[in-house]
């Protein structure tokens, strides 16, 4: 393992597809992949009138957008389906939405909003 890199070996698993069929498939997914590829965890969810509806959680495979992210944070502004990925065992247990504001005029007192966390 490379020093400073969080190896992902397992992730929280949830799949709404299966839940609809009452197969109760929720738990811990072991992550597999090529030795030279990185493995990540992810979460994807919808925000329906303020209510969080998880769609899927599990392992994600080698994606530069997930490299060295210890927290699962969606940064896109108002996506239809929220998605975040991270590195480290079970790092997708908690996920958050923290949109990156496109600041045109810097304010004298910039405020960093605290991201809402879901789990």
């Amino acid at each position: 393992a490379i020093l400073g890199r969080s190896e992902t070996q397992e992730c929280l698993f949830f799949n709404a597809n299966w839940e609809k069929d009452r197969t109760n498939q929720t738990g811990v997914e072991p992550c597999y992949g090529d030795k030279d590829k990185r493995r990540h965890c992810f979460a994807t969810w919808k925000n329906i009138s303020g209510s969080i509806e998880i769609v899927k959680q599990g392992c994600w495979l080698d994606d530069i957008n997930c490299y060295d992210r210890t927290d699962c944070v969606e940064k896109k502004d108002s996506p239809e389906v929220y998605f975040c990925c991270c590195e480290g065992n079970m790092c997708n247990e908690k996920f958050s939405y923290f949109p990156e504001m496109e600041v045109t005029q810097p304010t004298s007192n910039p405020v960093t909003p605290k991201p809402p966390y879901y789990n």
Epitope: F13, N15, N17, K20, D21, T23, N24, Q25, G27, E29, P30, C31, Y32, G33, T44, V55, K56, Q57, G58, C59, W60, L61, D63, E80, V81, F83
Partner: antibody
Framework: QVQLVQSGAEVKKPGSSVKVSCKAS????????ISWVRQAPGQGLEWMGG????????NYAQKFQGRVTITADESTSTAYMELSSLRSEDTAVYYC?????????????WGQGTMVTVSS | EIVMTQSPSSLSASVGDTVTITCRAS??????LAWYQQKPGKAPRLLIY???SLHSGVPSRFSGSGSGTHFTLTISSLQPEDFATYFC?????????FGPGTKLEIK
């Protein structure tokens, strides 16, 4: 590297059942996601259902609900697909396939396929 | 059920050409879109998963893009072994569904 080896070709009568096996080797079978996909001659691909052996319960495409049963035997690392009430339209090559992840990112390893012919 | 459509249904091209195949989903599938190549008498082969990730061992001339309902597979600098049928597949919601296929033929 996982390998999937399927049972041989079958010829069946309309109204009967067929059970196709798929033996996995090369990794922890119970933590694979195994799907069954079929392809009628000269036609496209059709997903029938899938199973994670560790959970034991399968998810089926509505079209096959009640007619297909997907099971897994962890002791022999073998998955099975049984299709009942066969009709001529069920003539197809049946593939067992491993998915990259439990959330189904892509079907990366395919068995060699089992030809099932339904004919009177 | 999510219906997948592909265009064109067939196309002719020459070695060295760049071709693009389009896949559309009847409703959003986020990034849960894969591309497969199939040759006669053989099982399909995974090329692209998660809309744009290249599967192990697949040449870099294959690339995928898109999200939601509109996806593309691009093959640059076509090689003789690339002439085959290509399928897209969504696995966002069950039943997982495939496109009808695009047959790529030598001009």
């Amino acid at each position: 590297q996982v390998q999937l080896v399927q049972s041989g070709a079958e010829v069946k009568k309309p109204g009967s059942s067929v059970k196709v096996s798929c033996k996995a080797s090369g990794r922890e079978f119970e933590s694979l996601f195994i799907s069954w996909v079929r392809q009628a001659p000269g036609q496209g691909l059709e997903w029938m259902g899938g199973i994670i052996p560790i959970y034991g319960t399968a998810n089926y495409a509505q079209k096959f609900q009640g007619r297909v049963t997907i099971t897994a035997d962890e002791s022999t690392s073998t998955a099975y697909m049984e299709l009942s009430s066969l009709r001529s339209e069920d003539t197809a090559v049946y593939y067992c396939v491993k998915d990259l992840t439990w959330t189904n990112l892509g079907l990366d390893i395919w068995g060699q396929g089992t030809m099932v012919t339904v004919s009177s | 059920e999510i219906v997948m459509t592909q265009s064109p249904s067939s196309l002719s091209a020459s070695v060295g050409d760049t071709v693009t195949i389009t896949c559309r989903a009847s409703q959003g599938v986020s990034r849960w879109l894969a591309w497969y190549q199939q040759k006669p008498g053989k099982a399909p082969r995974l090329l692209i998963y998660a809309a744009s990730s290249l599967h192990s061992g697949v040449p870099s001339r294959f690339s995928g893009s898109g999200s939601g309902t509109h996806f593309t597979l691009t093959i640059s600098s076509l090689q003789p072994e690339d002439f085959a049928t290509y399928f897209c597949q969504q696995s966002y919601s069950t039943p997982f569904t495939f496109g009808p296929g695009t047959k790529l033929e030598i001009k």
